[in-house]
Interface confidence: low
């Protein structure tokens, strides 16, 4: 903690200005009034404070606002945002996208993924849902940040907003997040023609169920291997060799490259070797010819 001292009269601060860069830590602590600092936060970022001096300023704001900073202060944090922890940010109530933009710009190039994720979460909570303006802001200022939201938060995305999401915004999304987003995307793009629909739905397919993947295989879509590899294992396993060949089109050759990786490996193990051989790719590991396949799960369900 910063040592408490009395402010020398000649060091009294009436304005937040450049003169403060010459103050030692204890002088800043003693001489800067927290309310003045909060009122003139917009000036802080124009002054080249050291990280140590910023620590002092943060400490003063924490004392003034123990329940969390007001948005008028948050908006003008500037580089002081780099000093915030996720725990600090969790106390905030943020509704303005201008605030979000300002802080996303500051965080660029710094290792702040946890803080940014928490900030976005607070914005979604503050605004009540993940609306189009918020999504537009995230895609413009923080590609990939959409995936930092929990599935619960993503569930507040209205289908009408899905069109604003770009493929690169979903690169880091996990299966649980795509499980939430895929049905919304399906709804959002349902009136599009086949090829246009596939282009739009492709980034979301990691959340698609088997029946939808099977349906796509009948539509001449030529799914690329990268997309196929991101499909849910459970969605891929029931597909037949013919369905996979139709689904991938010219990219079916890539199965050879990926034969050791899930979900391709798991899918191969469930196919008859005879069927795999029809692909002409030399895929190995299928069920040998003449073997009888017993689905024990069905038998257990019956007993």
């Amino acid at each position: 903690d910063v040592e408490r001292t009395t402010c020398p009269p000649e060091k009294e601060v009436h304005e937040i200005d450049e003169s403060l860069i010459f103050y030692k830590k204890r002088e800043l602590e003693a001489c800067v009034d927290a309310a003045l600092l909060a009122a003139q936060m917009d000036r802080v970022d124009a002054i080249p404070f050291t990280y140590e001096q910023l620590d002092v300023l943060k400490h003063k704001l924490d004392e003034l606002y123990p329940q969390g900073y007001p948005e008028s202060v948050i908006r003008h944090l500037g580089h002081l945002f780099l000093k915030m922890s996720p725990e600090d940010i969790r106390k905030w109530n943020v509704t303005s996208l201008e605030t979000l933009k300002a802080l996303l710009k500051v965080s660029k190039g710094h290792e702040m993924s946890a803080q940014v994720a928490t900030l976005i979460d607070r914005v979604v909570v503050g605004r009540g849902q993940l609306d189009k303006d918020t999504v537009d802001t995230l895609t413009a200022f923080c590609p990939g940040c959409l995936c930092s939201l929990s599935p619960e938060r993503l569930s507040s995305v209205p289908p009408s907003v899905i069109g604003a999401v770009r493929p690169q915004d979903l690169d880091t999304c996990g299966p649980r997040q795509l499980d939430v987003l895929y049905p919304k995307a399906r709804l959002a793009f349902q009136n599009m023609s086949g090829s246009e629909y596939f282009v739009k739905i492709r980034p979301f397919l990691g959340g698609a169920p088997t029946e939808d993947v099977k349906a796509l295989s009948q539509q001449n879509v030529s799914m690329d291997l990268a997309t196929f590899m991101k499909l849910r294992r459970e969605a891929v396993l029931p597909l037949t060799v013919a369905e996979v060949q139709k689904l991938l089109g010219p990219h079916v050759e890539g199965l050879k490259v990926e034969e050791q990786h899930s979900p391709v490996r798991d899918w191969i193990l469930k196919q008859r070797q005879d069927d795999l051989d029809t692909l002409g790719l030399g895929l190995q590991g299928g069920i040998p010819n003449g073997y009888l396949i017993l689905d024990l799960s069905v038998r257990e369900a019956l007993s």
Epitope: D171, D224, M229, H251, K256, V257, G280, L281, G282
Partner: antibody
Framework: EVQLVQSGAEVKKPGASVKVSCKAS????????MHWVRQAPGQGLEWMGN????????YYNERFMSRVTMTVDKSTSTAYMELSSLRSEDTAVYYC??????????WGQGTLVTVSS | DIVMTQSPDSLAVSLGERATINCKSS????????????LAWYQQKPGQSPKLLIY???TRESGVPDRFSGSGSGTDFTLTISSLQAEDVAVYYC?????????FGGGTKVEIK
């Protein structure tokens, strides 16, 4: 040893068609895709398309879609590439190449096709 | 289509010296799931067919001398010949095998200085 032996050089007039053959040996013909790549004189390589010898399915580069046909004869382990409506800019060496995955692991010796009036 | 850009167009290197060829793709060639980069390098000697050197950006084809190595990820790739030999005089091509149509770089001619 894998070998791809292509047919000899051809001279064609503009508007005509050419059919280049590629006889494969030293491996199971139906287990690997066959690609066709061309190279104009002094130029780089251009992928034309590929064919699955097992099913006969072929996929063409859109640039050639309306003019190219790729076929196979499994009984002789031979792949064919036919290019129609020839023009002078089709003068090139045409290669068949067997895939190793998605890359081109083995290449034929090339067939020079000259289009000239 | 994915555009492949090679540099330099030509390169003159002394025997025994290192030769470096760059290849840039207009889209990532990295499959984020398998972490494979779908890029191959070929060597074409004068009057001959191309020959596969490297696939998956860095996996050397069997029989290729270990002075040839590939590196890079995403959109930027490099082929390095650590100690140039007289028999390495050729044109070198990169090729993406990630999306059809598979496309090649324009080629880099390597000569002896």
């Amino acid at each position: 040893e894998v070998q791809l032996v292509q047919s000899g050089a051809e001279v064609k007039k503009p508007g005509a068609s050419v059919k280049v053959s590629c006889k494969a040996s030293g491996y199971t013909f139906t287990n690997y895709w066959m690609h066709w790549v061309r190279q104009a004189p002094g130029q780089g390589l251009e992928w034309m398309g590929n064919i699955n010898p097992s099913s006969g399915d072929s996929y063409y580069n859109e640039r050639f879609m309306s003019r190219v046909t790729m076929t196979v004869d499994k009984s002789t382990s031979t792949a064919y590439m036919e290019l129609s409506s020839l023009r002078s800019e089709d003068t090139a060496v045409y290669y068949c190449a067997r895939s190793g995955g998605l890359w081109l692991a083995f290449w034929g010796q090339g067939t020079l096709v000259t289009v000239s009036s | 289509d994915i555009v492949m850009t090679q540099s330099p167009d030509s390169l003159a290197v002394s025997l025994g010296e290192r030769a470096t060829i760059n290849c840039k793709s207009s889209q990532t060639l990295l499959n984020s799931v398998s972490q494979n980069n779908y890029l191959a390098w070929y060597q074409q000697k004068p009057g001959q067919s191309p020959k596969l050197l490297i696939y998956f950006a860095s996996t050397r084809e069997s029989g290729v001398p270990d002075r040839f190595s590939g590196s890079g990820s995403g959109t930027d790739f490099t082929l390095t010949i650590s100690s140039l030999q007289a028999e390495d005089v050729a044109v070198y091509y990169c090729q993406q095998h990630y999306r059809t149509p598979y496309t090649f770089g324009g080629g880099t001619k390597v000569e002896i200085k």
